[in-house]
């Protein structure tokens, strides 16, 4: 009972932190850069993400455009893109291997085959989460070097948007789901056929002491 | 009009001293990142050292870490260079340069001093 | 310490021809390259940062671009007054460093 409630318990963290991961990667809020004008007094925040960048007026008026030309882009934002991508479809196929292993569903029903797929489902998980995790500490590493770096221009150094927080927390959520998920395992893998054999060999001196008894119970 | 004006520059034997410095006039000097560059007489480019807006945090190359100390006086908005134990190599014009809100690297240069290292 | 190799170290153009000078990087620099022009006599001018971004004044017929390590400043129509000395310098990581220089001359 224990058991499946960690497992429902690492299924419903892997999927906020796929959400997460989602809300991450579609907001334009990696790097936020705040820009107040030294002659005029202008005040407007740019939002730059992986998809689209936009600029917010002090007055609240929100523009945004979305970025071009793929070729166009630099490399690390299109490593990040893909990681992205890859990291959310990771997930998705770490809930499929779950549902097909689940305690509660009957696609599979040899109980050490379900208790593999979790397993799996639980490792496929924290790949999805270190997937999700390369993308965000690179850009923020990208940040503080620039912020600490005296040539790089105030207007052009930027700020860690909320996008890389709820990357981390989409990152450590799926970290922790897939975690649990492989520690309610103990009947699954490598430990299933040991739990088995033990089962048969404190049976089995009783069976074969039984015989040898026999004659000697026989002979008296 | 943004202007910087360096001097102390001139002549000076190997393991002398010589202090540079940089007047600064046209912009409000505690604001901007300030750094010297140097430039032989092969007239290869060299980053000498820079120093932050409020002085706090000063960055050298190995080439002259130890040897050579940044500062400033943001009351007065001048740029100091103190230079000891040059050597022969050290012979360059020294450029006092400002940084820039929007543009990064080194976006206004000074005129220049040149130094000397000989015996 | 990350080196730039620029090349050509000089170069002779004619008026309204187009040039390309260009810098290598020993290294990943991303695009932290800065292009600066030094005419006769004077000091070095920021003409280009952020590896394509131009300063503000600097004629449209300079463009500056990345591919990778190597970097690339392209006069569209060369003019007499882009006689000058052109370096390249990155401002990646500490320390910073210039290329050797291309002189540019009008044929």
């Known amino acids: 009972m224990a058991s499946a409630g960690m497992q429902i318990l690492g299924v419903v963290l892997t999927l906020l932190g796929w959400v997460n991961g989602l809300v991450s990667c579609a907001l334009p809020m990696w790097k936020v850069t705040a820009f107040i004008g030294n002659s005029i007094v202008v005040a407007q925040v740019v939002w730059e993400g992986l998809w689209m960048s936009c600029v917010v007026q002090s007055t609240g008026q929100m523009q945004c455009k979305v970025y071009d030309s793929l070729l166009a882009l630099p490399q690390d934002l299109q490593a990040a893109r893909a990681l992205c991508v890859i990291a959310l479809l990771v997930a998705l196929f770490g809930l499929l291997v779950y549902l097909a292993g689940a305690k509660c569903t009957t696609c599979v029903e040899e109980k050490d085959s379900k208790a593999r797929l979790v397993l799996t489902s639980g490792i496929v998980f924290v790949i999805s989460g270190v997937l999700t995790l390369i993308p965000v500490c690179w850009t923020a590493h990208a940040i503080i070097r620039d912020f600490y770096n005296p040539l790089v221009a105030e207007a052009q150094k930027r700020e860690l948007g909320a996008s890389l927080y709820l990357g981390w927390a989409a990152s450590g959520l799926l970290l922790l789901g897939g975690g649990l998920l492989c520690c309610t395992c103990p009947s699954g893998g490598s430990q299933g056929p040991s739990h088995y054999m033990a089962r048969y060999s404190t049976s089995a001196p009783a069976i074969s002491r039984g015989p040898s008894e026999y004659p000697t119970k026989n002979y008296v | 009009e943004v202007k910087l004006v360096e001097s102390g520059g001139g002549l000076v034997k190997p393991g002398g001293s010589l202090r540079l410095s940089c007047a600064a006039s046209?912009?409000?000097?505690?604001?901007?990142?300030m750094s010297w560059v140097r430039q032989t007489p092969a007239k290869r480019l060299e980053w000498v050292v820079t120093?932050?807006?409020?002085?706090?945090?000063?960055y050298y190359p190995d080439s002259v870490k130890g040897r050579f100390t940044i500062s400033r006086d943001n009351a007065k908005n001048t740029l100091y260079l103190q230079m000891s134990s040059l050597r022969a190599e050290d012979t360059a014009v020294y450029y006092c340069?400002?940084?820039?809100?929007?543009?990064?690297?080194?976006?206004?240069w000074g005129q220049g001093t040149l130094v000397t290292v000989s015996s | 310490d990350i080196q730039m190799t620029q090349s050509p170290s000089s170069l002779s153009a004619s008026v309204g021809d187009r040039v390309t000078i260009t810098c290598r990087a020993s290294e990943n620099i991303d695009s932290y390259l800065a292009w600066y022009q030094q005419k006769p006599g004077k000091s070095p001018q920021l003409l280009v940062y952020?590896?394509?971004l131009l300063v503000d004044g600097v004629p449209s017929r300079f463009s500056g671009s990345r591919s990778g390590t190597q970097f690339s400043l392209t006069i569209s129509s060369l003019q007499p007054e882009d006689v000058a000395r052109y370096y390249c310098q990155h401002y990646y990581s500490i320390p910073y460093t210039f290329g050797s220089g291309t002189k540019l001359e009008i044929k």
């Open positions: 046209g912009f409000t000097f505690n604001s901007y990142t």
């Open positions: 120093i932050s807006s409020g002085g706090g945090r000063t």
């Open positions: 952020a590896s394509t």
């Open positions: 340069i400002r940084g820039d809100y929007r543009y990064d690297g080194f976006a206004y």
